[in-house]
Each structure stands twice: as C-alpha cells, then as structure tokens.
Interface confidence: low
C-alpha cells in the first residue's frame, strides 16, 4: 500500500473521523490538506486499497493571488446506506512531486440492531406432519441470539437457550404463526410473522370397493386434519391415455378430468357415467376450512365389461322354400365391451324354442328340414360380450309356410362348407 515518506512534513491538516452506525445510515468522511502550488487529486483508500468508484467530491480554495501560493484542498467521501461491506479503515492519499502521502486513518463501523438474512416464510403443512422453519440474523455487534415464538409465545425461556437457525416443528393440529426474535447488545429485532396453515393430510389407500360397467365405487382413508373437520373430498377421474401416460407424481392430468365431490363421512363415492371396459386414473383430495390436501397419486382403475345395452338392429327374416335367411346389423346402443358374437333363437307356434350361437357373423341360413307346416315362426337375436347377453330383439316373424308341409321345424343351420347343427 502507498506510504508517506518522512522526508517532508505531511500536507494533511485534517484526517478522516470515525463513523459507527446502523445499516442504512448515510455519513461523510472528510480530509483536508494544505499544499503549495497546483493542488493534487485526492484518492481514498479502504483497508489500503484505492477506491476506484468512490462517491467523493473535492473542493480547492487558493490562499493567495498567485498559482504558486498555498491551496486548501478538501475531499469528502459520501457513504450512502451503510452496509457491512463499507466497514473498515479509511485514509486519503495524494501524490506530491515524487512523494506519496497518506492521512491518518478513520474507521467506519457497523453496529446496531440485528439484521435478518433469512426469515420464516408462510407455508402450508399437512396436519401432524413435521417441518422446519429457518431464521438467520447477524450483527454487529455479535453475538446474535435467536428466540422463536409460536403464536406470540416464546418457545424457550431466554434468547440463546432454544433452537437457533432452524426450528423443527414435530407437527401442528391448528393453523399457527411463527416468528423469531434476534437479540444482540443493541436490542432486539423481530422477524416477519409466518403463517403456517394446517391442511388435511393426503388421503391414504384410495381403492376400489366395487366395479360396474359404468360406475366405480371407490373408498379411501382420510388423513388427519387437525382441529378442522373435513368439509368434503374431491375425486377426479380421467381417461387413461397410453399415449400421454399419467406419471405417479404428475401434478396435472393431460385432459380435463371428471370431478366429483363427496360429502364426508363416509369416505366413499360412487363415480358414475363412466365408459364400460375402459381404463381410468383416479385421485382424491380432501378439504377442510383451511384448504385442500394434496392429491393422492393417480391410481389406475378399470371399469369391467357390461352387456350390450340394445338388441341387434334391422333384423330381417325371409324364407325361400325350406330355407330361412336371417340377417341383422350390430346394435346401435353401446356394446359396453368387446362384441363376442350373437345368439339367435327361433320358435314356431307349437315347437320348442331353438337357441343358437352364431359367433360374429351377422347372417345365418336356417335349413328347415322336412316338409312340415309351421305357423307363426319367429326369430329373435341378441348380442353378447364377455359380461353376458344383451337384450333380445323383438320377435321377427317369418311369413307362414305353405299348407301341406307336415313335419315340424326341429333341425337347423346349414351354411356352405359348415356342418348342420341339429336339435333333438
């Protein structure tokens, strides 16, 4: 660092004073020198280092008429909003000819009420769930002791005898406020007050109680909610989409979910208007007066197959001699599953009903063996899934057979390249 020589007397007639104050203080350091001839530029040092960007002003006043007479030079360094980084030893420095001169030092100190580097933040926590709060303060002067308060009540008997920077709270059953006090030799500073809102715990073991083709009955175990009773639970269901894929922790579904509210208790809900034989993902959250719990993870569920809701359509039954040709179209009503086939029943007025499984074909030829006359022959068709048969169609009549045919209808089905099925 530059040092003044002892060859000549120091030009400084006024040295920087001392400043001690709290953060944010504004102050000024001043030094004064008297020199002969052209006044030099005054530099400021902090802890021996030149301050390149100092907020300083220099005033020069001649003491005589001539340039070679003496000059009084005053330099002022302004410190705005005092911070810890401003503290240290300050000196003025001048270059005069081949010599360097520095003033006597002055000191800038920071001393006041504690200053918070970290304060507790507002947050929500689940009831009876541990969490931590943080608080950090500094001087000078040191040391700084912290005292935590819950709902304005101290959690220790005196500063320094309780938890310091981090407060571990084992759990809350009601919404509470927390703050910390920082104590030092200058006094006490109180942090902001953080509100810790107690929400219900996430519901547990969301599960299916029963399945129907268009509804799922689900149940769950509610989490603790502290002193606040649960007002309702909200269940969301979304169609599973293998393309999108709902991840266990994904916060939002890929599409608008079906949302239902359940009064509680009981912690059970019948979720209706679903598609049969369809995978869904469901989740639940429960709400108290303080707000909602977090959602459970998405649970994959599936509605079972149902039976078709309607009969086959456009059934026509015509005959040509001893053959009856029956054809139909797939039900317009929802199938509620995978169509496995059709069942056909036919019956004459005085003959037993004959039941056939046609498979997935939509037509069949009945080989009516013998020349019997059968009156009022009717045909019904039903579609079926793995869950069972759908409703039968209304009976469709065949036109009356020619008179003179004596044998009753009792044997059936013949299609090219397939054997005939016969009923005794």
């Amino acid at each position: 660092a530059p040092r003044g020589t002892q060859a000549e007397e120091s030009p400084f007639v006024g040295n920087p004073g001392n400043i001690t104050g709290a953060r944010g203080l504004t102050g000024t350091l001043r030094c004064q020198l008297q020199v002969q001839g052209e006044p030099p530029e005054v530099h400021w040092l902090r802890d021996g280092q030149i301050l390149e960007l100092a907020d300083s002003t220099q005033t020069q006043v001649p003491l005589g008429e001539d340039e070679q007479d003496d000059w009084i030079v005053v330099s002022q360094l302004r410190i705005t909003s005092l911070q810890l980084s401003d503290t240290g030893q300050y000196q003025c420095l001048v270059f005069l000819g081949h010599q360097t001169f520095v003033s006597q030092p002055g000191y800038v100190g920071l001393e006041g009420l504690p200053y918070f580097l970290e304060e507790p933040e507002d947050r929500t926590v689940a009831a009876n769930t541990p969490f931590n709060l943080s608080c950090q303060a500094q001087g000078p002067p040191e040391p700084v002791d912290l005292l935590w308060l819950q709902d304005a009540v101290p959690l220790a008997t005196a500063p320094g005898h309780g938890p310091q920077r981090s407060l571990h709270v084992p759990g809350l059953n009601k919404t509470s406020s927390f703050s910390c006090e920082a104590h030092n030799a200058k006094g006490v500073t109180t942090s902001r007050t953080a509100t810790i809102t107690v929400l219900p715990q996430q519901p547990r073991n969301l599960h299916l109680v029963s399945r129907q083709p268009t509804e799922l009955e689900v149940a769950w175990t509610p989490g603790l909610s502290g002193i606040y009773p649960l007002t309702h639970c909200t269940l969301q269901a979304v169609l599973s989409d293998d393309g999108m894929g709902i991840q266990a922790g994904e916060p939002d579904p890929p599409e608008e979910p079906l949302t239902s509210q359940a009064s509680v208790p009981p912690h059970q809900l019948r979720l209706g208007s679903l598609h049969p034989h369809t995978p869904y993902h469901i989740r639940v959250a429960c709400t108290s007066s303080q707000g909602p719990s977090s959602w459970t993870h998405w649970l994959p569920v599936e509605t079972p197959e149902g039976v078709p809701l309607g009969p086959p359509e456009n059934i026509s039954a015509t005959r040509n001699g001893s053959q009856a040709f029956v054809h139909w179209q797939e039900p317009r009503a929802p199938l509620q599953g995978t169509l496995l086939g059709y069942r056909l029943a036919y019956q004459g007025q005085d003959t037993p009903e004959v039941l056939m499984d046609i498979g997935l074909r939509q037509e069949v030829t009945l080989e009516l063996q013998g020349d019997g006359s059968v009156s009022n022959l009717t045909v019904c068709v039903a579609a079926y899934t793995a869950a069972g048969d759908g409703p039968w169609s209304l009976p469709v009549p065949l036109e009356a057979w020619r008179p003179g045919q004596a044998q009753p209808v009792h044997q059936l089905v013949k299609e090219p390249s397939t054997p005939a099925f016969s009923w005794p």
């Epitope: 073991n205 299916l208 109680v209 399945r211």
Partner: antibody, heavy 118, light 107 residues
C-alpha cells in the same frame, strides 16, 4: 422370506370370544399390503373374514361385521382377530394371509384349528 | 355377494394328462379371479390372479383363462406334485368369495 403364523386356543366355549394372533416375520405390516383373516369350515368351504391395511384401516365381511374386530401391534409385527359371541358354527381352521389391493393373497399361514364346544 | 360355483368337485387324472377346472361367478367379476393350491401340511399357494396372470415361481404348465363370469384353470402335463385341492376366489369386490374347491386325485 415372508412367513405368517397363526396362534390361539384350540377350544372355545359357545358365547365366548375367539382371539387369534398372526405373527409376521420377514416383512413389516406397516410397510405395505393388507393383512387378512380367512377361515375354512369342515367340508372345505372358505370364507374371507376381513383385513387390516398397513395404514391401520380395516374392512370386514358384512356377514361378520357385528362380531369381528381386527387390530394390530406394530411393535411386535402382529395382527389379531377377535370374534365375539361364537357358536358351534364358528368351528373352523383359521388362516391369516396378506395381499395387495384387489390382488390375491400371496402368502398364507399354516392355519390353526379352532373348535367351539361346551 | 358374488357367488362362485366351482366344478367339478372331484377329479381323477393320471400324470401327464391335461385337466381343466371351471369357476362360474353369479355376476361379472371382470378378470379378477384367483386360483390357489392347497396341500396338507403346506401353506396355501397362489397360482394365478387376475384371471390369467401367473404368480411368480409358478410353473408354466398352470394357466388361467376367462373373464366376466366364466373362468378356467388348466394344468397341462400333470406332475405327481400337482395332485391337491384347488380353489378359485374372486377379488373383484369385497367381500371376497371362494369356490367350493376341486379335489384332484391320481387315477
């Protein structure tokens, strides 16, 4: 390996309560799974009685709901069956088992035979 | 409650043969049917769940099929250790219910 072992009295008098213990080794009953009681009557008919879930919630067969209670002692890794007001119809071999939600029971105990008789 | 009807109640077969056991539910239980094997002195063994999913460690000669109300357990190429009691159980809804059992004996 997970093992379940039932224990309790061989003989219970009618109108008394039947108490059985299932001791689980090799897995904590608070970690996962549902923990069930099933019984098998003479003639081999099996009846599911109920379970206690790892969270502590329970579910019972409606046919037994007024008489059954399933509890646990997590420190001993045991769960219990209590059946009150027993009759001779409750004579059976009692099994404990575990399962995941809506999946079948993958571990069973050996079973313990209980006779209700005066 | 869902009633489960299991058939046959008794079945005699020879090692190497293939056998089938059937269970019928009183209403649709989707695919949620399990099969167990019971042998004296041993703990009950889960063979198949969800109709057709083979439980870990179970030989592939055991297979399950069916959905809705009708289900089948097939054991192909019977081994001597397969002669035992077999039960089906629906795990679609509570209360869980079981079939009456099938006793498979050596012919």
């Amino acid at each position: 390996d997970v093992q379940l072992q039932e224990s309790g009295p061989d003989l219970v008098k009618p109108s008394q309560s039947l108490s059985l213990t299932c001791t689980v080794t090799g897995y904590s009953i608070t970690s996962a799974y549902s923990w069930h009681w099933i019984r098998q009557f003479p003639g081999n008919k099996l009846e599911w009685m109920g379970y206690i879930h790892y969270s502590g919630s329970t579910n019972y067969n409606p046919s037994l709901k007024s008489r059954i209670s399933i509890t646990r002692d997590t420190s001993k890794n045991q769960f219990f069956l209590q059946l009150s007001s027993v009759t001779t119809e409750d004579t059976a071999t009692y099994y404990c088992a575990r399962s995941l939600w809506f999946y079948a029971m993958d571990y069973w105990g050996q079973g313990t035979s209980v006779t209700v008789s005066s | 409650d869902v009633q489960i009807t299991q058939s046959p109640s008794y079945l005699a077969a020879s090692p190497g043969e293939t056998i089938t056991i059937k269970c019928r539910a009183s209403k649709s239980i989707s695919k949620y049917l399990a099969w167990y094997q019971e042998k004296p002195g041993k703990t009950n063994k889960l063979l198949i769940y969800s109709g057709s999913t083979l439980h870990s460690g179970i030989p592939s000669r055991f297979s399950g099929s069916g959905s809705g109300t009708d289900f089948t357990l097939t054991i192909s190429s019977l081994e001597p250790e397969d002669f035992a009691m077999y039960y089906c159980q629906q795990h679609n809804e509570y209360p869980w219910t079981f079939g009456g059992g099938t006793k498979l004996e050596i012919k």
